[in-house]
């Protein structure tokens, strides 16, 4: 028998520095977690103790903090090289700055293979990107070889900016021939490493003949065997065992997100490459693991540029940006409108001639807007200003909801109106009218939404049974501020870009902004 240790991360999302337990900015260092310096210590400790170790990443290193905003992927290549990753799969967020924003900082600089079998380049891009990412890679490990085959969510064109010259094929259809190829090369130990979410990971384990282990990402799935060490609730045991269609037991793993855990899976293979046993657990990277001094010094060195960036002007406002709780928790506020407009703008994807865009709606809890921005400071808006407005380090995500769920959400928005509570919704691509004289749960008297399947966008009444795409904070997607109906009834959830980054990009693009209060949210009394 031959034993392999697989160390894995996924959805790190630019958390190069240690973070608080909830993966936001580290405040009390003695209670902070993760970060590449701490990750390096644990990885090296395991490499010290075990002879056959692979360190893999299942995508979405890009996007999530000011590190990505400033360094644009150069930081990912540099620190992943320093940690000596053995392979990485492309995630959807690796395309956030377009194909060029992937090629130059990451693909050309990485000293490890970057993989995806279901992304096919065409046109002029095909020769430009040739060899920079691969469908699979055979890695020598000790006296053996291990095949790693990559995959990426086929929803990427709706979630990011891969352009028109990359085709995202069905994962299973694309993976099978590559695995077959590895088998003909006498590679009998094969890991599928990819970024399509836990449901697809399980399908790959079930359907793709010859895959021995699946290491996934995208859905931020936390798996654990035994008592979990922090706040995350396991979605199943680690590893999650899937019985394949040809009767094999295939371990599937994922390691939550944000570099909080290091996935640790030990696999025992027989001489024919069959999995005899698999066991392990994610390792919580808490403060009991010291940050490596060499990597930490490097982080501190790279950090300097971030501090300078925070105070530079992104753009100007010629109006007061009212982010006060007195406004945003009671009525339409222009800061809410600005943020929602930025959220929609960030999700413009012309992927179908029938649709002007795939999504037109935004909702945003007023309690998530934490500060106004005064225009009387020469109109200057900085990252620092935006960090005061959006201090929680969240993301603006894409969900699919039924109209009936949206209606419930808007009823919840005003169910206890007047108490300055955070659930009051700011909107974009939505016109809502409330009648507060009616009883809670029956106060939404008009709810019109902007069409997407139209050449001239206009507002139509919400249909209860129709499925709509909506951009919203991850806080709401996870049921925050009492929006349990969103969490319970959402049909799809894809994590998006860092909230501050979305707004800062929009302001930089617009140069001068002047958001108004324009009647998106109205109040009425009497008959309708």
């Amino acid at each position: 028998a031959w034993e392999l240790t697989i160390l894995h991360t996924n959805d790190v999302h630019s958390r190069l520095e240690q973070t608080s337990e909830d993966s936001s900015k580290c405040v009390n260092a003695s209670r902070c977690m993760g970060g590449v310096a701490r990750l390096f210590t644990k990885v090296q400790q395991i490499r010290r103790a075990e002879p056959n170790v692979l360190l893999l990443d299942a995508g979405d290193q890009y996007q999530g903090t000011i590190w990505f905003t400033v360094y644009k992927g150069a930081e990912v290549a540099h620190f992943m090289n320093a940690l000596r990753y053995d392979a990485m799969a492309l995630g959807n967020h690796e395309f956030d700055n377009g194909v060029e924003g992937l090629i130059e900082p990451l693909l050309k600089e990485a000293k490890f293979p970057i993989l995806s079998a279901n992304i096919k380049a065409k046109g002029p891009l095909a020769s430009q990107i040739s060899g920079l990412y691969l469908p699979y890679k055979v890695l020598p490990v000790g006296d053996e070889v291990v095949g790693i085959v990559g995959y990426t969510s086929k929803e990427t064109p709706f979630l990011s900016n891969p352009g028109t010259n990359l085709v995202f094929e069905d994962e299973i259809t694309a993976l099978q021939p590559e695995v077959d190829k590895l088998k003909t090369l006498n590679v009998n130990k094969i890991i599928a490493l990819g970024h399509s979410g836990f449901e697809m990971d399980k399908l790959i384990a079930q359907k793709v003949r010859g895959v021995d282990v699946v290491v996934g990402g995208h859905s931020n799935t936390f798996l654990y065997t035994g008592n979990p060490p922090s706040k995350e609730v396991p979605a199943g045991k680690y590893p999650f065992i899937v019985t394949s269609d040809d009767g094999r037991k295939v371990p599937v793993v994922q390691a939550y997100a944000f570099g909080k855990y290091l996935g640790y899976l030990k696999i025992e293979f027989d001489e024919r490459g069959n999995v005899i046993s698999s066991h392990g657990n994610p390792i919580l990277l808490n403060s009991s693991i010291p940050e490596d001094p060499s990597i930490k010094a490097d982080i501190n060195k790279w950090r300097i540029k971030l501090d300078n960036y925070s105070t530079q002007e992104l753009g100007k406002t010629i109006v007061y940006l009212d982010g006060s709780s007195q406004s945003c928790r009671f009525r339409e506020c222009n800061m809410g409108n600005l943020i929602c407009d930025a959220m929609i703008n960030n999700n413009l994807r012309h992927t179908d001639e029938m649709f002007w865009n795939h999504v037109s709606m935004c909702i945003l809890n007023g309690g998530g807007i934490r500060s106004p921005i005064d225009e009387r400071n020469n109109g200057t808006i900085t990252w620092e200003n935006l960090a005061a407005v959006l201090p929680f380090g969240g993301t603006f995500d894409l969900v699919q909801l039924k109209g009936s769920t949206l209606k419930k959400a808007f009823e919840h928005s005003v169910h206890r109106y007047g108490q300055s509570t955070g659930e009051f919704l700011q909107v974009g691509g939505i016109h809502v009218v409330y009648d507060l004289s009616r009883k809670p749960g029956d106060r939404v008297v008009k709810l019109d939404v902007l069409c997407t399947k139209c050449r001239v966008p206009s507002y139509d009444p919400l249909k209860m049974d129709e499925v709509y795409k909506v951009i919203l904070p991850n806080f709401l997607a996870n049921g925050g501020d009492g929006f349990q109906m969103i969490k319970d009834e959402l049909l799809r959830h894809d994590s998006g870009d860092q909230d501050i980054n979305v707004v800062s990009t929009y302001i930089s693009k617009m140069k001068v902004i002047y958001p108004a209060v324009e009647g998106r949210i109205k109040f009425s009394t009497g008959s309708h």
Partner: antibody
Framework: DVKLVESGGGLVQPGGSRKLSCAAS????????MHWVRQAPEKGLEWVAY????????YYADTVRGRFTISRDNSKNTLFLQLTSLRSEDTAIYYC??????????????WGQGTTVTVSS | DIVMTQSPASLAVSLGQRATISCRAS??????????MNWFQQKPGQPPKLLIY???NQGSGVPARFSGSGSGTDFSLNIHPMEEDDTAMYFC?????????FGGGTRLEIK
């Protein structure tokens, strides 16, 4: 368990050559930088040379540059130090030490038992 | 090169008492907020063993009675309470820049 075993020491004439080896086991050798450190009889420690995990980065002490060559074979889990143009002041116990770092040096965390090189006519 | 000066050259301490060894660097060994100072213990006929790295972090399996402190150019190694097994040579070493340099050593014995 981490094990580093040096070999190849012995008596060499001034101007002569010697190749030291360090066999590593019990860990993923290819993930760690490696050093040679020497200690002259009844003296302190002197760092000699460093090689990164993938052999991309190599450093030498001024006292040995041009005479000693550090190399490694990751497939055989072995570190080498080729000694040439030996002088009497090169007489020492030669330790191989692993670095906790990978591509850039960090700190020596494990040491072998050492092999003795005596340069004398 | 950074010159490391250790003091005292030798030290005798009673069992259960505190032993303090100092090390001064000819220039700062700090780099971006990290002090690249390490301490080693060496017993006769044995290779050195890592005690402390980055000024204050304990090496793997090192007893809690060994602690390190300092920054910039001035560092110290503390052993408390002193045990019989602690009789050895102690070396400081900087890993801020090439060439890595060691102090001349401090011989610690029981009084």
């Amino acid at each position: 368990d981490v094990k580093l075993v040096e070999s190849g020491g012995g008596l060499v004439q001034p101007g002569g050559s010697r190749k030291l080896s360090c066999a590593a086991s019990g860990f993923t050798f290819s993930s760690f930088g490696m050093h040679w450190v020497r200690q002259a009889p009844e003296k302190g420690l002197e760092w000699v040379a460093y090689i990164s995990s993938g052999s991309r980065t190599i450093y030498y002490a001024d006292t040995v540059r041009g005479r000693f060559t550090i190399s490694r074979d990751n497939s055989k889990n072995t570190l080498f130090l080729q000694l040439t143009s030996l002088r009497s002041e090169d007489t020492a116990i030669y330790y191989c030490a692993s670095d906790f770092g990978s591509s850039s040096p960090n700190y020596f965390d494990y040491w072998g038992q050492g092999t003795t090189v005596t340069v004398s006519s | 090169d950074i010159v490391m000066t250790q003091s005292p050259a030798s030290l005798a301490v009673s069992l259960g008492q505190r032993a303090t060894i100092s090390c001064r660097a000819s220039e700062s060994v700090d780099n971006y907020g990290i002090s690249f100072m390490n301490w080693f213990q060496q017993k006769p006929g044995q290779p050195p063993k890592l005690l402390i790295y980055a000024a204050s972090n304990q090496g793997s399996g090192v007893p809690a009675r060994f602690s390190g402190s300092g920054s910039g150019t001035d560092f110290s190694l503390n052993i408390h309470p002193m045990e019989e097994d602690d009789t050895a040579m102690y070396f400081c070493q900087q890993s801020k820049e090439v060439p890595w340099t060691f102090g001349g050593g401090t011989r610690l014995e029981i009084k």
